[in-house]
């Protein structure tokens, strides 16, 4: 899977959208590596 910063950001946005935003506060692009997905 793509692990550039932009890919990570878009994947996280999709995850947040699907979860209704119910995730940990530190679950942000600059804290999350591609392996988190």
């Amino acid at each position: 899977a793509c692990d550039t910063a932009t890919c990570v950001t878009h994947r996280l946005a999709g995850l947040l959208s699907r979860s209704g935003g119910v995730v940990k506060n530190n679950f942000v692009p600059t804290n999350v590596g591609s392996k988190a997905f």
């Epitope: 910063a5 890919c7 942000v28 692009p29």
Partner: antibody, heavy 119, light 107 residues
Framework: EVQLVQSGAEVKKPGASVKVSCKAS????????MNWVRQAPGQCLEWIGD????????NYNQKFKGRATLTVDKSASTAYMELSSLRSEDTAVYYC????????????WGQGTTVTVSS | DIQMTQSPSSLSASVGDRVTITCKAS??????VAWFQQKPGKAPKSLIY???YRYSGVPSRFSGSGSGTDFTLTISSLQPEDFATYYC?????????FGCGTKVEIK
């Protein structure tokens, strides 16, 4: 309201360095990567690199590696792009840009900083 | 580096026309492509990410499609404010690379 506000236009001599700033507001600066892109007159857009403001990690376009340096001042929510050993071909508009998720999912760009390299 | 080849480099169209711009990547970039609109003297404005998703606030007349190496931006009914230059970008691999633009002019 998310804003990326860049420093003003610069005129530099060949061989000099320039440091462009990008002040972020309206979101948590350390949560999102900051990109730097440039556009020379009549040329394509060129990606310079990105920086993780949280940890300071960087990715550079090899074309600029060794000449471009990306840094941040977390306390001031400001990103910087320094370009050294300037040549006339570096005359361009330099942009910072960041894809933000909260408060609004969008790809925000600064207004651009014109850097002119001329003897 | 991945080359992004846009075509045409310019086109003339009238208000109400359907406009299609294509972008070809030199290697597979999955759907990791964005499209931007730029007007003279202004910063680029983001329209599309992940090949086909519109950012909030982008009019529905703009749509993107494609995957792998071939991508398309379509404007279903051109409006006066749409006359601008459009760029594609891949962000699947570092360094990110852009197409050299398609200028949409008034016929």
């Amino acid at each position: 309201e998310v804003q990326l506000v860049q420093s003003g236009a610069e005129v530099k001599k060949p061989g000099a360095s320039v440091k462009v700033s990008c002040k972020a507001s309206g979101y948590t600066f350390t949560d999102y990567y900051m990109n730097w892109v440039r556009q020379a007159p009549g040329q394509c857009l060129e990606w310079i690199g990105d920086i993780n403001p949280n940890q300071g990690g960087t990715n550079y376009n090899q074309k600029f590696k060794g000449r471009a340096t990306l840094t941040v001042d977390k306390s001031a929510s400001t990103a910087y792009m320094e370009l050294s050993s300037l040549r006339s071909e570096d005359t361009a508009v330099y942009y910072c840009a960041s894809i933000i998720i909260v408060p609004n999912y969008f790809d925000y760009w600064g207004q651009g900083t014109t850097v002119t390299v001329s003897s | 580096d991945i080359q992004m080849t846009q075509s045409p480099s310019s086109l003339s169209a009238s208000v109400g026309d359907r406009v299609t711009i294509t972008c070809k990547a030199s290697q597979n970039v999955d759907t990791n492509v964005a499209w931007f609109q730029q007007k003279p003297g202004k910063a680029p404005k983001s329209l599309i990410y992940s090949a086909s998703y519109r950012y909030s606030g982008v009019p529905s007349r703009f749509s993107g499609s494609g995957s792998g190496t071939d991508f398309t931006l379509t404007i279903s009914s051109l409006q006066p404010e749409d006359f601008a230059t459009y760029y594609c970008q891949q962000y699947n691999n570092y360094p990110y690379t852009f197409g050299c633009g398609t200028k949409v002019e008034i016929k």
